[in-house]
Interface confidence: medium
């Protein structure tokens, strides 16, 4: 999906008032220091298309995170102020079904919710400047 | 609804083996693990061994390598637990469950295995 | 394998008691653990996951709390229907291990 048209106000707005309170809850107990940010994004729908990613792509090591109130509500938002968003995921969810390789191994979820919060932030500076 | 419903009752001689059942229904089987625990009777929850229904790839506990077969049939969205050369301590209630991280957000309704001669 | 400690092994409370039940991890496990209520002759029930996020259908009654090796499972007012085992289950790594479980009877 391109994220290019959506109305990134509109979108700050919801995370700053729902999204940032709910992905905070889920670190809570862990300090910022107990992760490294390794995923970076430059651009407003660059850190929308990273956003997306991890919030609702499984990864080997968390496969969870897409039942989450947070990412409920990430849903709600890009499917509101992104226009066509809604179409394209239900195909992009029925493709990926297949096509993940999931491991036993560590939990990694804690860290990836660490990466989101740093893609969040930085769609947020990102938006600053640009005003 | 999301139901895990085990096979029942077992009753078997040391050194024999048993397969436990666990047919999954309401969701996509294979988008989580099933995971089985086993629970000895008045005795704590052990986590045996693990399943990825999509690809058959398991993970086992240690302690049951060699004597536990984990096993996925996504046609009927069932999986299997087979433990080989029984012996009385592995009376016990066999548990599979549902996770996506390692937490059990569905169980079956437990299978009881009984090991006597 | 990191091994989950919970204490006490048994308690005796009455209905509307505040009930604390405490779980200790034999090592850094962040915030993944996870809490279960086991009835007799039932399968468990998962209460809270990721220290302390309740899944839906759950009584508000009970809260998780903690992270690193100590957590704790508080029932606010004990109902009838709270009388079980509750057990503790870290899910960091493999192999998932769990407490041995606290028992919860009527005084």
């Known amino acids: 999906y391109d994220f290019t048209n959506c109305d990134f106000q509109k979108i700050e707005a919801d995370y700053l008032r729902t999204i940032s309170k709910d992905l905070i809850t889920y670190m809570s107990g862990t300090k910022s220091t107990d992760f490294n940010n390794t995923v970076s994004c430059s651009n407003r729908p660059h850190c929308l298309t990273e956003i997306q990613s991890l919030t609702f792509n499984p990864t080997p090591r968390c496969a969870s995170l897409a039942k989450e109130m947070f990412a409920r509500k990430t849903k709600a938002t890009l499917a509101l102020w992104c226009p066509g968003y809604s179409e394209t995921q239900i195909n992009a969810t029925q493709a990926m079904k297949k096509r993940r390789k999931r491991k036993v191994t560590t939990n990694k979820c804690l860290e990836q919710v660490s990466q989101l919060l740093g893609l969040w932030r930085r769609f947020i500076r990102t938006l600053l400047k640009q005003q | 609804q999301v139901q895990l419903v085990q096979s029942g009752a077992e009753v078997k001689k040391p050194g024999s083996s048993v397969k436990v059942s666990c047919k999954a229904s309401g969701y996509s089987f294979i988008s989580y693990w099933i995971h089985w625990v086993r629970q000895a009777p008045g005795q704590g929850l052990e986590w045996m061994g693990i399943i990825d229904p999509s690809d058959s790839d398991t993970s086992l506990n240690q302690k049951f390598q060699g004597r536990v077969t984990i096993t996925a049939d996504e046609s009927t969205s069932t999986a299997y637990m087979e433990l080989s050369s029984l012996r009385s301590e592995d009376t016990a209630v066999y548990y599979c469950?549902?996770?996506?991280?390692?937490?059990?957000?569905?169980w079956g309704q437990g299978t009881l295995v009984t090991v006597s001669s | 394998d990191i091994q989950m400690t919970q204490s006490p092994s048994s308690l005796s409370a009455s209905v509307g008691d505040r009930v604390t039940i405490t779980c200790r991890a034999s090592?850094?496990?962040?915030?993944?653990l996870a809490w279960y209520q086991q009835k007799p002759g039932k399968a468990p029930k998962l209460l809270i996951y990721?220290?302390?996020t309740l899944p839906e259908g759950v009584p508000s009654r009970f809260s998780g709390s903690g992270s690193g090796t100590d957590f704790t499972l508080t029932i606010s007012s004990l109902q009838p229907e709270d009388f079980a085992t509750y057990y503790c289950?870290?899910?960091?790594?493999?192999?998932?291990?769990f407490g041995q479980g606290t028992k919860v009877e009527i005084k």
């Open positions: 090592e850094n496990i962040y915030s993944y």
């Open positions: 469950a549902r996770s996506l991280d390692g937490y059990y957000d569905y």
């Open positions: 990721n220290a302390r």
């Open positions: 289950q870290h899910h960091y790594t493999t192999p998932w291990t």
